[in-house]
Amino acid sequence: KAMHVAQPAVVLANSRGIASFVCEYASPGKATEVRVTVLRQADSQVTEVCAATYMMGNELTFLDDSICTGTSSGNQVNLTIQGLRAMDTGLYICKVELMYPPPYYMGIGNGTQIYVIDPEPCPDSD
Amino acid sequence: KAMHVAQPAVVLANSRGIASFVCEYASPGKATEVRVTVLRQADSQVTEVCAATYMMGNELTFLDDSICTGTSSGNQVNLTIQGLRAMDTGLYICKVELMYPPPYYMGIGNGTQIYVIDPEPCPDSD
């Protein structure tokens, strides 16, 4: 009955602080409404990074002020997190909920370790 | 005879392509001459990155054209690898050999996964 969620073990943010990864879930049923949440786990503390609910076949829309963007294709969600700094390095967990129709299912990935390196500032132009 | 060698699991190179890590070995005897080798494992291929032999209490000297530098303190070697690019991301293994006096011991660490992100080029100054 458990829903399997797969995500990569490690991802590197690029030098602009953008990290992308795919979250894939094995849907036990024909879900039409899906909610995807990205959680960050540091020590034993878990916090929400962003979340979006979408109708299957439609676009994934995060809130305007969200640091996440994403697209969906079948049972795959392509997630992008931006504005990352070195201090944001950590484990990012993908949580998927099949909200409708019944039954409800929840699946949690093992997490993607995102590494972020702050860039060196460019020299001032004289 | 086997000798235990410890090294961190993961290290991030900084934005200038420099990565540092400590390689620590549990010396079974009173070695006076030690050789440290850094190996890179990609797929199943292992290549030598750099190597240095040093006398206990003396400085660690790599060849002039080596991309490695290091210092030693007791049974710890502080290794720095420079000039790294994103394509150099991989598993870097620390190998320690106690060359003298007998008996000879060799120890190999589990490897340090070094992640390297290429920086964005700075904009041209007009």
């Epitope: 009955k1 458990a2 829903m3 399997h4 036990p28 409404e33 909610r35 949440t37 959680l39 878990v46 916090t47 929400e48 979340a51 609910t53 967990i93 949580k95 909200m99 409708y100 019944p102 039954p103 409800y104 299912y105 929840m106 699946g107 949690i108 | -």
Partner: antibody, heavy 118, light 108 residues
Framework: QVQLVESGGGVVQPGRSLRLSCAAS????????MHWVRQAPGKGLEWVTF????????YYADSVKGRFTISRDNSKNTLYLQMNSLRAEDTAIYYC???????????WGQGTLVTVSS | EIVLTQSPGTLSLSPGERATLSCRAS???????LAWYQQKPGQAPRLLIY???SRATGIPDRFSGSGSGTDFTLTISRLEPEDFAVYYC?????????FGQGTKVEIK
């Protein structure tokens, strides 16, 4: 700190209605799904109903389906349970519970007792 | 519906002893979706373990969880006086959310 406070319990006759409330504080209420769980005197825990973040999705235990309605007002940080056509077997302590980020019920209210008796 | 069966119904032990509580599911439950709760008389349940083996915030390390598939265990390594209570397992991976019938840990 996180707090859930239930109210609205009491003694009611079979066939009548009752509305329970759960006031939430100390967290962003709209970011969490919520549940009602009940416990009959001397018995174990029984899940009753669930509501999604925005209140659009609701699930019920078979034992209360068609009689109970869960709702939420995110602007008031309050969860509700409307109980109609009450039966003697609905007698229980009713707890509201928050779903933690990873799924378990991480915070519970102190409970409110509903007694259905003629 | 996933039915959870706990055993034993009652466990009579002395402080300092080790308690082993079992929870068996009627079908496979992902270990990420199994929790344990503690309930004392007159109190609400309290989350102890989630994801089969992760301790909730503030829970002492004498409590540990293990298992996968259909068989899960809660272990209390050395019973303290405050540990005598009723313990429930729960699955939360799919609706309907279900609880075991509980195991009472009482003082011998």
């Amino acid at each position: 700190q996180v707090q859930l406070v239930e109210s609205g319990g009491g003694v009611v006759q079979p066939g009548r209605s009752l509305r329970l409330s759960c006031a939430a504080s100390g967290f962003t209420f709209s970011s969490y799904t919520m549940h009602w769980v009940r416990q009959a005197p001397g018995k174990g825990l029984e899940w009753v109903t669930f509501i999604s973040y925005d209140g659009n999705n609701k699930y019920y235990a078979d034992s209360v389906k068609g009689r109970f309605t869960i709702s939420r007002d995110n602007s008031k940080n309050t969860l509700y349970l409307q109980m109609n056509s009450l039966r003697a077997e609905d007698t229980a302590i009713y707890y509201c519970a928050r779903t933690g980020w990873l799924g378990p019920f991480d915070y519970w209210g102190q409970g409110t007792l509903v007694t259905v008796s003629s | 519906e996933i039915v959870l069966t706990q055993s034993p119904g009652t466990l009579s032990l002395s402080p300092g002893e080790r308690a082993t509580l079992s929870c068996r599911a009627s079908q496979s439950v992902g270990s990420s979706y199994l929790a344990w709760y503690q309930q004392k008389p007159g109190q609400a349940p309290r989350l102890l373990i989630y994801g089969a083996f992760s301790r909730a915030t503030g829970i002492p390390d004498r409590f540990s969880g293990s298992g996968s598939g259909t068989d899960f265990t809660l272990t209390i390594s050395r019973l303290e006086p405050e540990d005598f209570a009723v313990y429930y397992c729960q699955q939360y991976g799919s609706s309907p959310w279900t609880f075991g019938q509980g195991t009472k840990v009482e003082i011998k």
